[in-house]
């Protein structure tokens, strides 16, 4: 049994790091493999992650962590029974993929403005809480070519757009994702999308 593609890991910089790898042939990851991980710090205990299958030869493991500081380093050992298949290390702060924003809501009660709000996925004591910027994707349900991205580079998780910039009488969808500049992270996954109907009509004299 051997590793074809070594484990690569990303961290949400809060509580979960996800490691993925590929084996040389079909493998029952949860039955045959264990990923042991240990924080390189004061008598930290060794934790065991039971991997799941991710396709025929792929495995994925979710490493649980109580907290993260930027200097953290973990040793990783991939075992198949008594056989050590791979040994490596992982520094969460260097491989951050933020959590996806949540609770995306569209407010259309102000007649000429569409207000989108969402929740920051981190608590205030997490470094990423004040470091996230967002991208909001808005698209026309009936015309996928009518799609746009708004970059939100300020901290407040809100976006206002004039309703007049959207087609009237059309259903739109929006979703949002996040990244953190100081840790040069990858983008988060997109949030679940939310739908609304743009009922805005131009004032009569402008028609």
């Amino acid at each position: 049994m051997k590793v074809l593609q070594e484990p690569t890991c990303v961290s949400d910089y809060m509580s979960i790091s996800t490691c993925e790898w590929k084996m040389g042939g079909p493998t029952n990851c949860s039955a045959e493999l264990r990923l042991l991980y240990q924080l390189v710090f004061q008598s930290s205990e060794t934790h065991t992650c039971v991997p799941e299958n991710n396709g025929g030869v792929g495995c994925v493991c979710h490493l649980l962590m109580d907290d993260v500081v930027s200097m953290d380093n973990y040793t990783l050992d991939l075992w198949a029974g008594q056989q050590l298949l791979w040994k490596g290390s992982f520094k969460p702060s260097e491989h951050v993929k933020p959590r996806a924003p949540g609770n995306l809501t569209v407010h259309t009660n102000v007649s000429d403005t569409v207000l989108l709000t969402w929740s920051n996925p981190y608590p205030p004591d997490n470094y990423l809480y004040n470091d996230l910027t967002y991208a909001v994707n808005i698209w026309n349900e009936n015309d996928l070519a009518d799609s746009r991205i708004h970059n939100v580079t300020y901290l407040k998780p809100t976006l206002r757009i004039p309703a007049s910039t959207l087609k009237s009488g059309i259903s739109y969808r929006a979703r949002v994702r996040a990244w953190a500049q100081h840790y040069n992270t990858t983008w988060s996954e997109w949030s679940p999308s939310t739908k609304w109907y743009n009922s805005y009509r131009e004032p009569f004299e402008q028609r």
Epitope: S15, D66, Y127
Partner: antibody, heavy 116, light 112 residues
Framework: EVQLQQSGADLVRPGASVKLSCTAS????????MHWVKQRPEQGLEWVGR????????IYASKFQGKATITADTSSNTAYMQLSSLTSGDTAVYHC?????????WGQGTLVTVSA | DILMTQTPLSLPVSLGAQASISCRSS???????????LEWYLQKPGQSPKLLIY???NRFSGVPDRFSGSGSGTDFTLKISRVEAEDLGIYYC?????????FGGGTKLEIK
Amino acid sequence: EVQLQQSGADLVRPGASVKLSCTASGFNIKDTYMHWVKQRPEQGLEWVGRIDPTNGYTIYASKFQGKATITADTSSNTAYMQLSSLTSGDTAVYHCVSRRPWFAYWGQGTLVTVSA
Amino acid sequence: DILMTQTPLSLPVSLGAQASISCRSSQSIVHSNGNTYLEWYLQKPGQSPKLLIYKVTNRFSGVPDRFSGSGSGTDFTLKISRVEAEDLGIYYCFQGSHVPYTFGGGTKLEIK
């Protein structure tokens, strides 16, 4: 052996400032969060705030915002807390504590007495 | 801020007897990562506090097994199965799930 050595007791005048230090041995402060906890005479414990020494990111309890400033010098493995505009209500023992991810290691405490 | 309320304020016990201290939080202290960072500390006279229990039920290394923690949501309990003279002091619960982190008011364990 892990130790947090705090600076000695201080008697300070009302309105003045004081800077407390906490030097770690047996571990690197960059590997933890460093917190400060206030304990007034014959009273309970109050969380003041904390710092991630690597990036200097601080967070404070709202009642200590503007009162306490927590800093760290990773080259000397030391965390600091400055208290400003001191009043009699600031008379207390101040503990520095490392949290990873619980308060396993406490300093011996520094008594700050504010008196004219 | 989350208020941590400890009862009783003072707990007179006989050596060898069981002691139980309650800690109630004003709202849930489940962290957004799913863990509950509820801890118990003992402060003996003239000393700094020492960690006994973390994450509700886990004994810190070197803590005797007569100490046990339980609870969930907003209600938590520290039990000492057979009190010894060295257990005397003030016990504090603490929540490290939500900023600002907060301590309970303390429970003084004393000999009856």
